[in-house]
């Protein structure tokens, strides 16, 4: 929380690839790869829908919502078996992210 990000220095990330598959109606599948230079005790994650360095504890325990991965105003819920998380928009639309 509040760790410095900017240029690709310690504690920072940049998006390397972003692939979108919109072939299925009403559904878009996106695969994103980021490159992060994280400090000791941190690991690449997602904060406010952007790549970031987060505490390794969050990844180890699969408490994905602790990264604050969703945008402000959305609700975060863990998927069953903690394979990822969902972000629920105020209108009810749900965005699901799985971790691989």
């Amino acid at each position: 929380q509040f760790l410095k990000e900017g240029q690709l220095a310690a504690g920072t990330c940049e998006i390397v690839t972003l692939d979108r598959d919109s072939s299925q109606p009403r559904r878009t599948i996106a695969r994103q790869t980021a490159r992060c230079a994280c400090r000791k005790g941190q690991i690449a994650g997602t904060t406010r829908n952007k790549p970031s360095c987060v505490d390794a504890r969050i990844i180890k325990t699969k408490q994905w919502c602790d990264m604050l991965p969703c945008l402000e105003g959305e609700g975060c819920d863990l998927l069953i078996n903690r394979s990822g998380w969902t972000c629920t928009q105020p209108g009810g639309r749900i965005k699901t992210t799985t971790v691989s």
Epitope: R39, D66, L68
Partner: antibody, heavy 113, light 110 residues
């Protein structure tokens, strides 16, 4: 969107006290929640934080003296064994990676025999 | 443990520019935030991530950071700017996470 603290009152030393922060208009699942206190005429003092999962961290001086817990729309702060030095206004604050942008008005705790 | 040091009090003439500093005793790896607090009120976030302003905060308030010192600059000080100003930053991560406030600076506008 707002926060409101409640539960502040006059207590005698050693009597446990629980303060409650009630959140309105947003989900606690997408923010960090912290408790901060301010003794009369003094500066701000961070007590601790709770993450969406319920994981908590405390200031080194606060460990063992305070317990933070959370429910769907509330965050509690228990002062386990108050002393006169715990007399202060207690604030809850909503945070994310941009800092603490939303604060409650505070609730006053007075510890006196 | 990280300690943030601020001058206890600073005076500025109406309409002048004033800079408030916050010095960390060790080089902080984290962003600084600044909060304004008026008597009897809750703190208000003025600056986050060293230099960014939340919406609604006048552009008279600006932040900068160099080395282990963060600076809040108020241009064209107004009577309503009279308040206490606190800097803050996080320290550590994982099981050692801490959030630290400076001692605060009382700004008087004359």
């Amino acid at each position: 969107q707002s926060l409101e603290e409640s539960g502040g009152r006059l207590v005698t030393p050693g009597t446990p006290l629980t303060l409650t922060c009630t959140a309105s208009g947003f989900s606690l699942s997408t923010y960090y929640m912290s408790w901060v206190r301010q003794a009369p005429g003094k500066g701000l003092e961070w007590i601790g934080i709770v993450y969406p999962s319920g994981t908590t961290y405390y200031a080194n001086w606060a460990k063992g003296r305070f317990t933070i817990s959370t429910a769907s729309t509330t965050v509690d702060l228990m002062i386990t064994s108050p002393t006169t030095e715990d007399t202060a206004t207690y604030f809850c604050a909503r945070g994310d990676s941009f800092g603490y942008g939303l604060w409650g008005p505070g609730t006053l705790v007075t510890v006196s025999s | 443990e990280l300690v943030l040091t601020q001058s206890p009090s600073v005076q500025v003439n109406l309409g002048q520019t004033v800079s408030l500093t916050c010095t960390a005793d060790t080089l902080s790896r984290s962003y600084a935030s600044w909060y304004q607090q008026k008597p009897g009120q809750a703190p208000v976030l003025l600056i986050y991530r060293d230099t960014s302003r939340p919406s609604g905060v006048p552009d008279r308030f600006s932040g900068s950071s160099s080395g282990n010192t963060a600076t809040l600059t108020i241009s064209g000080a107004q009577a309503g700017d009279e308040a206490d100003y606190y800097c803050a930053t996080s320290d550590g991560s994982g099981s050692n996470y801490q959030y630290v406030f400076g001692g605060g600076t009382q700004l008087t506008v004359t």
